[in-house]
Interface confidence: low
């Protein structure tokens, strides 16, 4: 019963001219040990002779091995389990079917294995994940349907022709289930890798190029933006105009929406790549950026700090502290919104200018009763002088003086 023979090996093996082929193979002949083994190339059954015709690459009988002209073919098996074969070197005309003619005392079997030998080293195959996103680690896999103990090879990864510095893990399989060499590379692509060429290069033991496979990276990323402003220093005076332009340097997939933000809040009805601010007011000072979104998410430009300069506003005075007790100290603070900040201050006491007082703060170390009254100030910057505000009242408390009896 020929069904007693059970074989396991790869269905097809791949190699190229001058390399070698290692054929992992196991078998079971349940009725006894192997008595004779012949390895045929492209065997054909001859009905007249009831035998197989074809090139005999290897013969081994119970009387011993028949000397083979082809020392390159080796049967590495045994009489009851192992049918592993090696052909080194392997040639183009070895392509086709290998026939393992096995005979025990009572049974015969012809097992066929396909051998595919190419003229030149065939390329490996790069496998990429279905989607690659910026900054997310992915594993790139390079698979070659070849491995042979007598012919060491290596797989090297290149990005735009430059070796990738990340450590790749190479594994080989020479089992009855599969024969392959695989290299896996963990890689965190940046948006700038989009469109770049990754190559897996097959090299011999000396690093000589044999073949390669290339893929173009499709790195999904949020839009990358540049913001330009006129004037370039983003410093203007009230009433001037400002133009900001948003440029998309890269987006994958294509962008879908555009918006502008001021101090983190979206500006209504501003959905084009140019933001025109006419006759700006001081309220329009702040941090501006553009935001462009695609299916991956929103991308934001760097922030531009728009400074709208204006003359000081009417000043107010803050007194620390009123009422004040005679002999205590008091500090006056002149407060006025201005851009740039005021550089000079004028102080007034009861409407009369206080000489020599030009700072934001006035400090009186020892209050006397006559210091009581209204204090006001005027702030000044390069754009002009502000108005005097309403002022603040200093109340000075003191004990009775010059007591007279009535």
């Amino acid at each position: 019963d020929s069904s007693k023979w059970v074989f396991e090996h790869p269905e097809t093996l791949y190699a190229w001219e001058g390399a070698c082929v290692w054929i992992p193979c196991t078998y079971r002949a349940l009725d006894g040990d192997l008595e004779s083994f012949i390895l045929f190339h492209n065997p054909e059954y001859n009905k007249n002779t009831s035998k197989f015709d074809g090139t005999r690459l290897y013969e081994s009988t119970k009387d011993g091995k028949v000397p083979s002209e082809q020392k390159r073919v080796q049967f590495l098996g045994d009489k009851n389990k192992n049918c592993t074969l090696s052909i080194h070197p392997v040639h183009l005309n070895d392509s086709g079917q290998l026939g393992l003619r096995m005979e025990s005392k009572t049974e015969k079997w012809m097992e066929r294995i396909h051998l595919n030998v190419s003229e030149r080293p065939f390329p490996p195959h790069i496998q990429l994940p279905p989607e690659i996103q910026e900054s997310q680690e992915v594993t790139l896999t390079c698979l070659l349907n070849f491995s042979c103990y007598g012919y060491p090879i290596q797989l090297q990864w290149l990005l735009e022709g430059v070796p990738m510095r990340q450590a790749a893990v190479t594994s080989t399989s020479l089992t009855i289930k599969s024969v392959f060499t695989r290299s896996e590379l963990k890689f965190s692509p940046q948006w700038s890798h989009h469109g770049k060429i990754v190559t897996c290069q097959l090299q011999d033991a000396d690093g000589k190029f044999l073949s390669n496979d290339t893929v173009q990276l499709n790195v999904k990323h949020t839009p990358k933006l540049e913001i330009k402003v006129t004037p370039s220093d983003a410093i203007v005076r009230e009433g001037d105009s400002v133009t900001m332009t948003c440029e998309v340097s890269s987006s994958n997939p294509e962008y879908t929406t555009v918006s502008w933000l001021k101090d983190g809040t979206s500006l209504k009805k501003q959905n084009t790549f140019t933001l025109n601010l006419r006759e700006v007011t001081k309220d329009q000072s702040g941090k501006y950026c553009c935001q462009v979104s695609n299916d991956v998410g929103p991308g934001r430009s760097e922030e531009v700090f728009l400074q709208v300069q204006y003359a000081p506003e009417p000043s107010t005075v803050q007194i620390l502290h009123s009422p004040a007790v005679e002999g205590s100290q008091v500090e006056f603070l002149c407060m006025s919104l201005a851009n740039p900040l005021p550089t000079n201050y004028t102080w007034y006491h009861n409407g009369k200018e206080m000489q020599g007082r030009t700072e934001e703060k006035v400090h009186i170390p020892k209050i006397l009763p006559w210091h009581a009254g209204t204090y006001s100030c005027v702030a000044e910057n390069i754009l002009g002088t502000g108005q005097r505000g309403p002022g603040a009242e200093l109340d000075v408390q003191y004990p009775p003086k010059k007591v007279t009896t009535v």
């Epitope: 790869p10 269905e11 097809t12 065939f122 195959h125 496998q127 896999t141 349907n145 599969s178």
Partner: antibody
Framework: EIQLQQSGPELVKPGTSVKVSCKAS????????MYWVKQSHGKSLEWIGY????????RYNQKFKGKATLTVDKSSSTAYMHLNSLTSEDSAVYYC??????????????WGQGTSVTVSS | DIVMSQSPSSLAVSVGEKVTMSCKSS????????????LAWYQQKPGQSPKKLIY???TRESGVPDRLTGSGSGTDFTLTISSVTAEDLAVYYC?????????FGGGTKLEIK
């Protein structure tokens, strides 16, 4: 005849764990990889991972790493899948699948009858 | 992971009618080295385990009637039943075995009118 006999249905409490078994017969246990597949009620199939009984090598779907642990007992030709920290999301029918594949990836496959796991308090 | 999308999700046909169902993958399942498409079709009858019908996108498993035909390449695949019988009542799943993790489509439920 190749057969895969799976353990019976399980009703377990949230937070606990369960071990599903799959006993193989009719073939050399070490020559077929054992795959596991999840099918939630009325839903599609999800590939959990496989174990090679010959050497114990495993490969998991990233989604099930830490959730499922695959082991084998060669002496009894049995494969096991241990599921931990169970939640209602783990309620499903779990299938074992014995696969023999060649180097190109084609697979001869045989399926178990499925094991129903219900997670409920 | 490779995403598999099937359509329609369900369909009802009369016995003897021809039916086609579609399966699309998020990346090509055609392996350039051997020109094979790493796609299989499974049939799951009510209360049963899935059963493989077709592999390499178009090769029938032994014992599968030739009424069932798989076709397509790359990312678009089709399963056709030329003349539906009551036996065909089932959910049909496509599955890619191009790269790990292997993934299945959502299924197409075939009902008989």
């Amino acid at each position: 005849e190749i057969q895969l006999q799976q353990s019976g249905p399980e009703l377990v409490k949230p937070g606990t764990s369960v071990k599903v078994s799959c006993k193989a017969s009719g073939y050399d246990f070490t020559r077929y990889n054992m795959y596991w597949v999840k099918q939630s009620h009325g839903k599609s199939l999800e590939w959990i991972g496989y174990i090679d009984p010959y050497n114990g090598d495993t490969r998991y779907n990233q989604k099930f790493k830490g959730k499922a642990t695959l082991t084998v007992d060669k002496s009894s030709s049995t494969a096991y899948m241990h599921l931990n920290s169970l939640t209602s999301e783990d309620s499903a029918v779990y299938y074992c699948e014995a696969i023999y594949y060649d180097m190109e990836g084609y697979a001869l496959d045989y399926w178990g009858q499925g094991t129903s796991v219900t997670v409920s308090s | 992971d490779i995403v598999m999308s099937q359509s329609p999700s369900s369909l009802a046909v009369s016995v003897g009618e021809k039916v086609t169902m579609s399966c699309k993958s998020s990346q090509s399942l055609l392996y350039s080295n051997n020109q094979k498409n790493y796609l299989a079709w499974y049939q799951q009858k009510p209360g049963q385990s899935p059963k493989k019908l077709i592999y390499w996108a178009s090769t029938r498993e032994s014992g599968v009637p030739d009424r069932l035909t798989g076709s397509g390449s790359g990312t678009d695949f089709t399963l056709t039943i030329s003349s539906v019988t009551a036996e065909d009542l089932a959910v049909y799943y496509c599955q890619q075995f191009y790269s790990y993790p292997w993934t299945f489509g959502g299924g197409t439920k075939l009902e008989i009118k």
